[in-house]
């Protein structure tokens, strides 16, 4: 998932990493009233052969892992991506300065897998 | 999606790439009777800021792209992964040499996005 990194060493296997995101850090504090931030988390790590059960791999990812093994120049490894995402409720100002409470889907990573 | 590569240049944006997979190439020819192979396809490319509408990005991916922009050493870019997968039907021999027709889910990539 990080193709712009040069890394010759073994990365850890695909998993969920904790990450707290502050809306102020994103520059969104002027329109988001609450919360001040949230535990977004993210996915990172290797999807290498052989994929084990913990990696929540799709059938396609299993096939792609084998093809990558034989053709690394042409076909990438499957990537470590969210498999379960949760929503959060956000209180914010709309364009007319009305206060709105809205549920934003797919904001929090709950689980990761090889896709 | 290819963190074990060295690449100093801009990659193309996340998209679906065509890939035909032969079951003989995977070494599965002794148990899969039909088909001989299938168009599996795969996803590859960059999920860089700003994510446009073609990239089928989740809300989390949009947040992660911004966090990566500010903290590239710690948080990777979202990765280019399948957003739509199709099944294929496979005729195969089971462990008791019975011929079975089974639908295998998530075998064909139909669309890709930033996750």
């Amino acid at each position: 998932s990080a193709s712009d990194y040069n890394s010759s060493e073994l990365k850890t296997a695909c998993r969920k990493h904790e990450l707290y995101v502050s809306f102020q850090d994103l520059g969104w504090q002027d329109w988001i009233i609450a919360p001040k931030g949230y535990a977004a988390n993210y996915c990172d790590g290797e999807c290498s052969f052989p994929l084990n059960a913990h990696m929540n791999a799709t059938n396609h990812a299993i096939v792609q892992t084998l093809v990558h093994l034989m053709n690394p120049e042409y076909v990438p490894k499957p990537c470590c991506a969210p498999t379960k995402l949760n929503a959060i409720s956000v209180l914010y100002f709309d364009d007319n300065s009305n206060v709105i409470l809205k549920k934003y889907r797919n904001m929090v990573v709950r689980a990761c897998g090889c896709h | 999606s290819a963190s074990d590569y060295n690449s100093s240049e801009l990659k193309t944006a996340c998209r679906k790439h065509e890939l035909y997979v032969s079951f003989q190439d995977l070494g599965w020819q002794d148990w899969i009777i039909a088909p001989k192979g299938y168009a599996a396809n795969y996803c590859d490319g960059e999920c860089s800021f700003p994510l446009n509408a073609h990239m089928n990005a989740t809300n989390h991916a949009i947040v992660q792209t911004l966090v990566h922009l500010m903290n590239p050493e710690y948080v990777p870019k979202p990765c280019c992964a399948p957003t739509k997968l199709n099944a294929i039907s496979v005729l195969y021999f089971d462990d008791n040499s019975n011929v079975i027709l089974k639908k295998y889910r998530n075998m064909v990539v139909r669309a890709c996005g930033c996750h």
């Epitope: 034989m70 120049e73 | 690449s7 003989q24």
Partner: antibody
């Protein structure tokens, strides 16, 4: 015709670097990967690394501990292999070779002799 | 890395002979095996790919067989042009070559 043409023989001192070129013609350069393989006198062929000529992704064998850099220039339809911190054991013929997906090396350069001697 | 072992290292034969070279992989490589011919001062030349498929332009006296870990290159009716060194190569996981078999005139 379809060919890979490599640069000429080189003599280098220990500790120096060498850069070997491999110019492709007769096919679409950017649709294949170029690999580098070397052969020391009387030894088996040894794989060194690859570059995809289209997207520029590359990877090197761990045997060379970051001494190998593989690059390419699409405008010149050429790939390059640079080997640094040369030692006498690096004396060998260096080959570039083309590889398609699901295939072995189907086209080779003529080879470049690199001699490392003080 | 997958290790490739060829036998014999040297083979003495005469024109018209049937010659067999064996290659063993340290683990299963399915049919991802190639055979190359190399003459002194020249680059290797692909003969066989996917264990048994003949490369375009290669004479039909060359044939390959095997799968998994055991592979064979056979030259039926050896010709004067066939005296050379032959290498097997696996391309299942990374790329490794056998140590070579030199076919020399008896």
């Amino acid at each position: 015709q379809v060919q890979l043409v490599q640069s000429g023989a080189e003599v280098k001192k220990p500790g120096a670097s060498v850069k070997v070129s491999c110019k492709a013609s007769g096919y679409t350069f950017t649709s294949h990967a170029i690999h580098w393989v070397r052969q020391a006198p009387g030894q088996r062929l040894e794989w060194m690394g690859w570059i995809h000529a289209g997207n520029g992704n590359s990877k090197q064998s761990q045997n060379f501990q970051d001494r190998v850099t593989i690059t390419r220039d699409t405008s010149a339809s050429a790939a390059y292999m640079e080997l640094s911190s040369l030692r006498s054991e690096d004396t060998a013929v260096y080959y570039c070779a083309r590889r398609a997906i699901m295939a072995p090396f189907d086209l080779w350069g003529q080879g470049t002799l690199v001699t490392v001697s003080s | 890395d997958i290790q490739m072992t060829q036998s014999p290292s040297t083979l003495s034969a005469s024109v018209g002979d049937r010659v067999t070279i064996t290659c063993r992989a340290s683990q299963s490589i399915n049919n991802w095996l190639a055979w190359y011919q190399q003459k002194p001062g020249k680059a290797p030349n692909l003969l066989i790919y996917k264990a048994s498929s003949l490369e375009s332009g290669v004479p039909s006296r060359f044939s390959g067989s095997g799968s998994g870990t055991e592979f064979t290159l056979t030259i039926n009716s050896l010709q004067p042009d066939d005296f050379a060194t032959y290498y097997c190569q696996q391309y299942y996981s990374s790329w490794t070559f056998g140590q070579g078999t030199k076919v020399e005139i008896k």
